[in-house]
């Protein structure tokens, strides 16, 4: 499975969307887990509602929220108030009994906000410029290329 690399700013929210075939995964709960080491187990962070028809309702564990649109085949995970310690390798999983099928591997990278490290007074923005062209203004970004991890 290819690994998707997602970047988010520290202190902000990062939204992850994992898509799957709604029919193949019919009736299955979804989970978000954190990979402990390259070959280690995947530690469950949060899973969708125990009643499958209610999977669209948000379930929270700490600063991580999960919700599943089981008809469209999209499970969405939101990592709120992103911290440096949240960086790492995660998995979206589809649960069937005691088995877990990996839907997607996600590498989360946390970017430090450059404003935190400098005096805002040192920054100068031309009056006529309403935005930084090409600057990163999204709360989260996804690299277009997919990086493969073993």
């Amino acid at each position: 499975l290819n690994t998707t690399v997602l970047q988010g700013m520290a202190g902000q929210s990062l939204r992850v969307s994992c898509t799957y075939d709604a029919l193949k995964h019919w009736g299955r709960r979804k989970a978000w887990c954190r990979q402990l080491g390259e070959e280690g187990p995947c530690q469950r962070v949060v899973s969708t509602h125990g009643v499958w028809l209610l999977a669209f309702l948000k379930k929270r564990n700490g600063s991580t929220v999960i919700a599943d649109d089981t008809l469209a085949g999209t499970v969405t995970i939101t990592l709120k108030n992103l911290q440096a310690g949240d960086a790492g390798l995660y998995q979206c999983q589809s649960l069937r009994g005691r088995e877990a099928e990996v839907l997607q591997k996600v590498l989360v990278e946390v970017l430090e906000d450059p404003l935190d490290d400098q005096d805002a007074g040192d920054l100068w923005v031309p009056e006529e410029s309403s935005s930084f062209e090409g600057a990163q203004v999204e709360h989260s970004t996804s690299r277009n290329q997919e990086t493969s991890f073993p």
Epitope: D21, L23, K24, W26, G27, L53, F56, L71, A72, G73
Partner: antibody, heavy 119, light 107 residues
Framework: QVQLVQSGAEVKKPGASVKVSCKAS????????MSWVRQAPGQGLEWMGV????????VYAQKFQGRVTMTRDTSISTAYMELSRLRSEDTAVYYC????????????WGQGTLVTVSS | DIQMTQSPSSLSASVGDRVTITCRAS??????LAWYQQKPGKAPKLLIY???SLQSGVPSRFSGSGSGTDFTLTISSLQPEDFATYYC?????????FGQGTKVEIK
């Protein structure tokens, strides 16, 4: 026992809309997804879409996108399917069918509603 | 969309016969296949799901097998009430699709 009772036959003119109802009994309406399948005279079965009765979320077959609307009223355990801009090819028997969570197969079906589109 | 092809499209058989209907998927659907029986003027009735699981209340003379792209519905000993049209349905890839049907007639 589980029952899905559909509204009666309809005759519509091309361009009109039709709304078919499906009243569920004998089980918890919000515990199962509801789908709609149609069958033209002498033809096979064609899946139209599905609704989650709790959230109201829907997914429609591409062929019917923009023409079909599936809704529900949980207070009376009833699902609805509305098809607009009818044409003669929409003449068919329309079935509601319940989907259990253990498999995407249709375990109980309504008796069917014949919709005839004719000028 | 996945195409489901049933064969034969119709067959004639006698009471007590062993009847086999096949269904082929245009791509691998694992074991995500269901079989239905439909009698004239009636709604379809679920017989088999997940290729081989018998739906509650369905007689044990009905059985299903297969995986991947090729599937079979077998009626071990045809009964008078079994004369009907049979449909397969794949439920492994969106959207779900049906075969064109196999009509089982009295010889």
């Amino acid at each position: 026992q589980v029952q899905l009772v559909q509204s009666g036959a309809e005759v519509k003119k091309p361009g009109a809309s039709v709304k078919v109802s499906c009243k569920a009994s004998g089980y918890t309406f919000t515990g199962y997804h509801m789908s709609w399948v149609r069958q033209a005279p002498g033809q096979g079965l064609e899946w139209m879409g599905v609704i989650n009765p709790v959230s109201g979320n829907t997914v429609y077959a591409q062929k019917f996108q923009g023409r079909v609307t599936m809704t529900r009223d949980t207070s009376i355990s009833t699902a609805y399917m509305e098809l607009s801009r009818l044409r003669s090819e929409d003449t068919a028997v329309y079935y509601c069918a319940r989907i259990p969570s253990y498999t995407y197969a249709f375990d109980y079906w309504g008796q069917g509603t014949l919709v005839t589109v004719s000028s | 969309d996945i195409q489901m092809t049933q064969s034969p499209s119709s067959l004639s058989a006698s009471v007590g016969d062993r009847v086999t209907i096949t269904c082929r998927a245009s791509q691998d659907i694992s074991n995500y296949l269901a079989w239905y029986q439909q009698k004239p003027g009636k709604a379809p009735k679920l017989l088999i799901y997940r290729a081989s699981s018998l739906q509650s209340g369905v007689p044990s003379r009905f059985s299903g097998s297969g995986s991947g792209t090729d599937f079979t519905l077998t009626i071990s000993s045809l009964q008078p009430e079994d004369f009907a049209t049979y449909y397969c349905q794949q439920h492994g890839h969106s959207p779900t699709t049906f075969g064109q049907g196999t009509k089982v007639e009295i010889k």
